[in-house]
Interface confidence: low
Amino acid sequence: EEELQVIQPEKSVSVTAGESATLNCTVTSLIPVGPIQWFRGAGPGRELIYNLKEGHFPRVTTVLDPTKRNNMDFSIHISNITPADAGTYYCVKFRKGSPDVELKSGAGTELSVRAKPSAPVVSGPTARATPEHTVSFTCESHGFSPRDITLKWFKNGNELSDFQTNVDPAGKSVSYSIRSTARVVLTRRDVHSQVICEVAHVTLQGDPLRGTANLSEAIRVPPTLEVFQRPMRAENQVNVTCQVRKFYPQRLLLTWLENGNVSQTETASTLTENKDGTYNWRSWLLVNTCAHRDGVVLTCQVEHDGQPAVSKSHALEVSAHQKEQCSDTTSGPVLAPTAPLGGSG
């Protein structure tokens, strides 16, 4: 009589997670009588996948009716494959007995599961940095298989080269994770900039996944200050303006000091936005030139986004003509009561 053979024709089968896999197995003889069972793995720790006689295997069905007489095809169909299903599957023939005795095993079919990477998540620095400084962005994606994967970084469409990427674990696994850290040098124009992490994998059919982060979350553009005075229609008044330019983010506290003493504090409200995403703001004081003391210095002090204050001072300039307009009896504060102490516009 011909010796029974258990034939598993494919050495390996590769499927995408969520799909079904067919594992083929045929036997060459109907004798000796006894069941076929499917296992994942070999040796004492192997896992029973399918046993026709007993057990509940909701995701496994036989391709043909195994109860049919003269059936020699014991191929199985596993539905809704996940990366955890990866491994080598063995079709094993048993001789009927009490208990059944293992007679012969197929050579095994390795099931590899192609799993899509998760949407890349890009995280930026926890604290803001100023232009010319380097910040790091991290991109993570998980759950993919096989291990081969390509990750690229872009800033505003331009590919970056300063990054380091690791794929874990290094050895064999049902699925893998990738983590990459890119270093980006900030510029003053980066408020509207975006970094993109792009992940390409065999499961994505040429349509890579992208994760993004806005540099607006990572950048602080400190303001530049300018203080100047302009005459007003009333000959004994001048307008002293503090122009705060090109700052980001919006959080800003402005304090006016007169000869070093705080005269007024205000929070930036009506800001104008520049094309590059930074903001401008101006605050002004109406100053009564008749109430001046010699050598009045007005200082505009700005605290931006919780950083140490920066300031710009201006020595009040009063012309001889303005002095002539003042009567000898004029007295009062330098800051004119004819208007709110500060304004914004």
Partner: antibody
């Protein structure tokens, strides 16, 4: 109470350009995405694209080559232009506001215009 | 693009009875920040769509509490605990995880 009102011609000739405007009243344009969505007769909804208040645009790839969305904050309006229209572009066009929060992303299209019917026919 | 599939296509309902609509996405809408980027909208006959549920389960302002959203990953459900006559119309799910934003084909709810 924010309200949106679409305006533009109801009839456009094939191969010409469709131009629609959405006027935002009762609220600010800042910090929202402003979206265009269309619905062909008897069919479902299709997202055309949106614009953030800072001018950044996002388009549906299937329409990207023909669509431009722009915004004018000074008059609280945003606009849709679609070139080379065909009968397949016949639809009710809606403008809508999409909430967005830092760290969360898109947070629901919470205000819609009443829609304007555009027919493409010669 | 993420494909959104709604079922059933049509749902005849009895006022006062519960109703349920399913929405499945071709990829997970659950992001690493814990939010599920799935919205539900109702378009009543002759009207514009109205936001009912955002982020899978959050009821929009002014929406009655008989509407609830649940689900995570790729499978989402909109439940109406007791259908009222004013609930007739087409319900749409929409993913907001990535552009292009995509809608389900709609489920038409009508009174039996």
């Amino acid at each position: 109470q924010v309200q949106l009102q679409e305006s533009g011609p109801g009839l456009v000739r094939p191969s010409e350009t469709l131009s629609l405007t959405c006027t935002v009243s009762g609220g600010s344009i800042r910090n929202y995405y402003w979206s265009w969505i269309r619905q062909p007769p008897g069919k479902g909804l299709e997202w055309i694209g949106f614009i953030y208040y800072n001018g950044r645009t996002f388009y549906n790839p299937s329409l990207k080559s023909r669509v431009t969305i722009s915004l004018d904050m000074s008059i609280n309006q945003f606009s849709l232009k679609m070139t080379s229209v065909t009968a397949a572009d016949t639809a009710v066009y809606y403008c809508a506001r999409v909430r967005a929060y830092s760290g969360i992303g898109l947070d629901g299209t919470d205000v819609w215009g009443q829609g304007t019917t555009v027919t493409v026919s010669s | 693009d993420i494909v959104m599939t709604q079922s059933p296509l049509s749902l005849p309902v009895t006022p006062g009875e519960p109703a349920s609509i399913s929405c499945k996405s071709s990829q997970s809408l659950l992001y690493s920040n814990g939010y599920a980027y799935l919205d539900w909208y109702l378009q009543r006959p002759g009207q514009s769509p109205q936001l009912l549920i955002y982020q899978g389960s959050n009821r929009a302002s002014g929406v009655p509490d008989r509407f609830s959203g649940s689900g995570s990953g790729t499978d989402f459900t909109l439940k109406i605990s007791r259908v009222e006559a004013e609930d007739v119309g087409v319900f749409y799910c929409m993913q907001a995880l990535q552009t292009p934003l995509t809608f389900g084909g709609g489920t038409k709810v009508e009174i039996k």
